[in-house]
């Protein structure tokens, strides 16, 4: 049994890091393998993660971690029984994938303005809470070409757009994702999408 692709890990910069790797053949990850991890810190203890299968030869492990700070470094040991298959380390702050925003809501009762709001996925004491920016994706269910991205570079988790920038009388969907420039993170997953029917009063034409 050998490791074909070494573990690569990403952190949500809160409490979970996810590590994925591939073995050289079909493997029952949960029965055959264990990933041991430990924060390099005087008051830390070793933890064991039981991996799950992720495709025939792929394995994935969800590591429960202490609140992350930038200096953290974890040692990782991948074992198959008594055999050490791979040894490495992981700095969560260098491999961050933020949590996805939640509670995306479209408020349509503001005069001819759409107000989209969502929740910051981090608690106020987390470093990323004040460092996230967002991308909002809006698309038409009827017209695949009617697809747009709005970049929200301010901290407030909201976006206002004129309802008239979208077509009236048809249904739209929206979703939102986050990233943090300070740690050069990847984008989060998209939030679940929300649907609304876009309708607004057309301005009277002057003749």
């Amino acid at each position: 049994m050998k490791v074909l692709q070494e573990p690569t890990c990403v952190s949500d910069y809160m409490s979970i890091s996810t590590c994925e790797w591939k073995m050289n053949g079909p493997t029952n990850c949960s029965t055959e393998l264990r990933l041991l991890y430990q924060l390099v810190f005087l008051l830390s203890e070793a933890h064991t993660c039981i991996p799950e299968n992720n495709g025939g030869a792929g394995c994935v492990c969800h590591l429960l971690m202490d609140d992350v700070v930038s200096a953290d470094n974890y040692t990782l040991d991948l074992w198959a029984g008594q055999q050490l298959l791979w040894k490495g380390s992981f700095k969560p702050s260098e491999h961050v994938k933020p949590r996805a925003p939640g509670n995306l809501t479209v408020h349509t009762n503001v005069s001819d303005t759409l107000l989209l709001t969502w929740s910051n996925p981090y608690p106020p004491d987390n470093y990323l809470y004040n460092h996230l920016t967002y991308a909002v994706n809006i698309w038409s269910e009827n017209d695949p070409a009617d697809f747009r991205i709005y970049n929200v570079t301010y901290l407030e988790p909201s976006l206002r757009i004129a309802a008239s920038t979208l077509k009236s009388g048809i249904s739209y969907r929206a979703r939102v994702r986050a990233w943090a420039q300070c740690y050069n993170t990847t984008w989060s997953e998209w939030s679940p999408s929300t649907k609304w029917h876009n309708s607004y009063r057309e301005p009277f034409e002057q003749h």
Partner: antibody, heavy 115, light 109 residues
């Protein structure tokens, strides 16, 4: 808002015991290492003890064998049991959250050791 | 055990002046594990700088940290009245734990 609220200081005779408490709020207590740091009157800061999220502990040589740090994650609370107290243990004791450094501190509680 | 020595013991300056505080370690310290605190009379210390140069949340940009190895510096670019206090450096070591410098008092001249 992160808050650490301390209680339990007071006057104790040499050789006596005292228990300090620290209640945390505004953060996930169970995922953070916690510490006690003290400051003798007119002196500098001295790290006393720390406890990790899994319960691993460490002590300054000056208190080893006499002080015991503990935590109750269900109550979001940190404790310091101080036995065989000496005159040199007299100080303001602070609880703190942190790891390699201490980012939030309690208000401090005075421990007076005197006969 | 790593010993941190701060200098000067006292710094007498006027508001608006630049303050430069030194922290010297008896052996090399990882920059990731060097922090600075401010303490005012009757108050708990407050984290100013961590990782030798990163400002903690809510700390004004007139405070900056620098250095590596055994020599670290805290600089206050323009002293405000509320900056007169005692400043401590602190380091963490994987074997020895946490130690503080003896402090530098910044007082009004």
């Amino acid at each position: 808002e992160v808050q650490l609220v301390q209680s339990g200081g007071g006057l104790v005779h040499p050789g006596g015991s005292l228990r300090l408490s620290c209640a945390g709020s505004g953060f996930t207590f169970s995922r953070n290492a916690m510490f006690w740091v003290r400051q003798a009157p007119g002196k500098g800061l001295e790290w006393v003890s720390g406890i990790g999220t899994g319960g691993a502990t460490n002590y300054a040589d000056s208190v080893k064998g006499r002080f015991t740090i503990s935590r109750d994650n269900a109550k979001n609370s940190l404790y310091l049991q101080m036995n065989s107290l000496r005159a040199e243990d007299m100080a303001v004791y602070y609880c703190a959250r942190g790891r390699y450094y201490f980012d939030y501190w309690g208000q401090g509680t005075l421990v007076t050791v005197s006969s | 055990e790593i010993v941190l020595t701060q200098s000067p013991g006292t710094l007498s300056l006027s508001p608006g002046e630049r303050a430069t505080l030194s922290c010297r370690a008896s052996q090399s310290v990882s920059s990731s594990y060097l922090a600075w605190y401010q303490q005012k009379p009757g108050q708990a210390p407050r984290l100013l700088i961590y990782g030798a140069s990163s400002r903690a949340t809510g700390i004004p940009d007139r405070f900056s940290g620098s250095g590596s190895g055994t020599d670290f510096t805290l600089t206050i670019s323009r002293l405000e009245p509320e900056d007169f206090a005692v400043y401590y450096c602190q380091q963490y070591d994987h074997s020895a734990g946490w130690t503080f410098g003896q402090g530098t008092k910044v007082e009004i001249k």
